[in-house]
């Protein structure tokens, strides 16, 4: 069956060193446990996180995301997932693409992460 992939309405903001959550879901909602779900970074399609055959596929991750990501699947039965990225870096800023693949049918949604420096301040005078 066909579906759309829905990402966040607006850019997501995070501070360097914090963790951030990138939500993604299918519409209409349905069980996505058996689907392939993933995030990659355009334009070079570097894999941020991949979930396939009911498991996280750590081996496919780009090195800069290894050990820093977690797919929250509490609501995957309704087609809703969240990617948690820990220890956010400046290099994480920019575009991410989330996709759901059901057999040969795939849809995706773009989202943007803005990363800010928690120690940034303007020097007086």
């Amino acid at each position: 069956g066909q579906f759309r992939v829905i990402g966040p309405r607006h850019p997501i903001r995070a501070l360097v060193g914090d963790e951030v959550e990138l939500p993604c879901r299918i519409s209409p909602g349905k069980n996505a446990t058996g689907m392939e779900v993933g995030w990659y970074r355009p334009p070079f399609s570097r894999v941020v996180h991949l979930y396939r055959n009911g498991k996280d596929q750590d081996g496919d991750q780009a090195p800069e995301y290894r050990g820093r990501t977690e797919l929250l699947k509490d609501a995957i039965g309704e087609g809703k997932v969240t990617l948690r990225i820990r220890n956010v870096r400046f290099s994480d800023e920019g575009g991410f693409t989330c996709f759901f693949r059901d057999h040969s049918y795939q849809e995706e949604a773009a989202m943007e992460l803005k990363v800010e420096d928690p120690f940034y301040w303007v020097s007086p005078g």
């Epitope: 829905i6 309405r9 939500p23 879901r25 509490d74 609501a75």
Partner: antibody, heavy 120, light 106 residues
Framework: EVQLLESGGGLVQPGGSLRLSCAAS????????MSWVRQAPGKGLEWVSA????????YYADSVKGRFTISRDNSKNTLYLQMNSLRAEDTAVYYC?????????????WGQGTLVTVSS | DIQMTQSPSTLSASVGDRVTITCRAS??????LAWYQQKPGKAPKLLIY???SLESGVPSRFSGSGSGTEFTLTISSLQPDDFATYYC????????FGQGTKVEIK
């Protein structure tokens, strides 16, 4: 089965306070944002407040900002609305609703509502 | 704030009629729109979300369409159980509801 059960409504004088509670069951409470929506007698629906699944982010309608406080206790699967400095125009049925997923989202499950009457 | 305007406010129809309710947003909300049905003394019930996705368990005679600022809810063949008040809701920036459309028996 998802269930939401509000309590705490009643009659209160203008300027008074009230705390509403919403007991949730049938889903992973901490994974969902939650909201309060109200409906004045014979009127339409008005979104009041929302809170993220972790409780770390809260949102308010301008009409209640500074007077109402939304909170949640994920260990008790319970949502709260503390209402202070109540006014006659706050009289309404207050519904607790599960956000479809994220903060300020669609509402896929609703409680039965609890009536708050502000009158002297 | 984003304002939502529904039309008509009241609609008189008969069983079997095709019914259309319109909702206009004061600015573009993409497809971040839902439709609810409410009966007297009851909580609202989600019918449509993301402008056109049918909520699980909702009869297929209900459908939604539109994007940007103009949206419609259509009931293809009105049933006795469908006489109620219908609300649209935007969730693009916080959440606001339309004023409601009451569908009554002609």
């Amino acid at each position: 089965e998802v269930q939401l059960l509000e309590s705490g409504g009643g009659l209160v004088q203008p300027g008074g306070s009230l705390r509403l509670s919403c007991a949730a069951s049938g889903f992973t409470f901490s994974s969902y944002a939650m909201s309060w929506v109200r409906q004045a007698p014979g009127k339409g629906l008005e979104w009041v407040s929302a809170i993220s699944g972790s409780g770390g982010s809260t949102y308010y309608a301008d009409s209640v900002k500074g007077r109402f406080t939304i909170s949640r206790d994920n260990s008790k699967n319970t949502l709260y609305l503390q209402m202070n400095s109540l006014r006659a125009e706050d009289t309404a049925v207050y519904y607790c609703a599960r956000d479809y997923w994220l903060d300020s989202d669609y509402f896929d499950y609703w409680g039965q509502g609890t009536l708050v009457t502000v009158s002297s | 704030d984003i304002q939502m305007t529904q039309s008509p406010s009241t609609l008189s129809a008969s069983v079997g009629d095709r019914v259309t309710i319109t909702c206009r947003a004061s600015q573009s909300i993409s497809s971040w729109l839902a439709w609810y049905q409410q009966k007297p003394g009851k909580a609202p019930k989600l019918l449509i979300y993301d402008a056109s996705s049918l909520e699980s368990g909702v009869p297929s005679r209900f459908s939604g369409s539109g994007s940007g600022t103009e949206f419609t809810l259509t009931i293809s063949s009105l049933q006795p159980d469908d006489f109620a008040t219908y609300y649209c809701q935007q969730v693009y920036i916080y959440s606001t509801f339309g004023q409601g459309t009451k569908v009554e028996i002609k």
